[in-house]
Interface confidence: medium
Amino acid sequence: HTAAQDNCTCPTNKMTVCSPDGPGGRCQCRALGSGMAVDCSTLTSKCLLLKARMSAPKNARTLVRPSEHALVDNDGLYDPDCDPEGRFKARQCNQTSVCWCVNSVGVRRTDKGDLSLRCDELVRTHHILIDLRHRPTAGAFNHSDLDAELRRLFRERYRLHPKFVAAVHYEQPTIQIELRQNTSQKAAGDVDIGDAAYYFERDIKGESLFQGRGGLDLRVRGEPLQVERTLIYYLDEIPPKFSMKRLTA
């Protein structure tokens, strides 16, 4: 993979180490933590990004509460196992031999078990609901302007094909972005909705993964769109398997 030839950096992933050791002295970038080569002309997979993040620990985030309707990333940061393509391995275990199954965005979808736990396949997250609350503004945003700007953002910044942005809902101050992408719909080279959602989440939190100078400056008709709360819900192609104890807790 090539990266910027001028100063050998990866524009899509600042959590990389780059050096001109590729074929013909070309710049090659490797993700921190895993050492895997990354393609700097597209988004890096969430698994490799999480692994890189764990290799350079920062203060823990405040986590959202789980929803009864969908999976929420309620377990927080962990050091994931990624397959050779950079995807999450279906089974994840910690250093104390506690294991669990995850979906394609790395969110736990079963109760925790021991090393005997089997996760037969990596279940695809096909529907992501991004729930945002924006800071108070003089008036509500125009819905069609907001819709167009968010669709443009996902198309232009994250390179997500427009057909995967299913809907943008708005009831001031709540904005909901629905991303849908079935296994059958995702062609080779398509950005994964899970990766796009993760980049968006980090952008919104002011923790951009892009190498560029500034963070995301999102505006609707010139008016800044400042987000004060983000919740992301994940729906899998196969429903998660949690015990009744957890569901009634």
Epitope: T2, A4, D6
Partner: nanobody
């Protein structure tokens, strides 16, 4: 580095057309936001049109409907088709490139690489 070279400027009568071209070379050319700016003596450089890799072009209100911007990522070329030219379109036109993977805007501060410029003169 990224290098940009404009061509296609010249003199034309009001109501006429010109087609500006910008050849871009360097790293991550297709992933960069690209724009056309123009500047007249004593005035700030202003954004005319901008485009990202996959997006639709954005235009300044003064040129909307008259100018059409496009890019050919295979040839690393940026084009600006200018129709129905007016004397107030007279300026030096600059091609600009932004950071890779940034959104296309008409703000000068979002662009870090610039061409040398090509003169466009529209007379009545």
């Amino acid at each position: 580095q990224v290098q940009l070279q404009e061509s296609g400027g010249g003199s034309v009568l009001a109501g006429g057309s010109l087609r500006l071209s910008c050849t871009v070379s360097g790293s991550f050319v297709s992933s960069r936001s690209m724009a056309w700016f123009r500047q007249t003596p004593g005035k700030e450089r202003e954004g005319v049109a901008a485009i990202s890799q996959y997006g639709d072009p954005k235009y300044a209100g003064s040129v909307k409907g008259r100018f059409t911007m496009s890019r050919d990522n295979a040839k690393n070329t940026l084009l600006l088709q200018m129709n129905s030219l007016k004397p107030e379109d007279t300026a030096i036109y600059y091609c600009a490139a932004g950071e890779a993977w940034e959104l296309a805007t008409l703000s000068r501060s979002d662009y870090i690489y610039w061409g040398q410029g090509t003169q466009v003169t529209v007379s009545s």
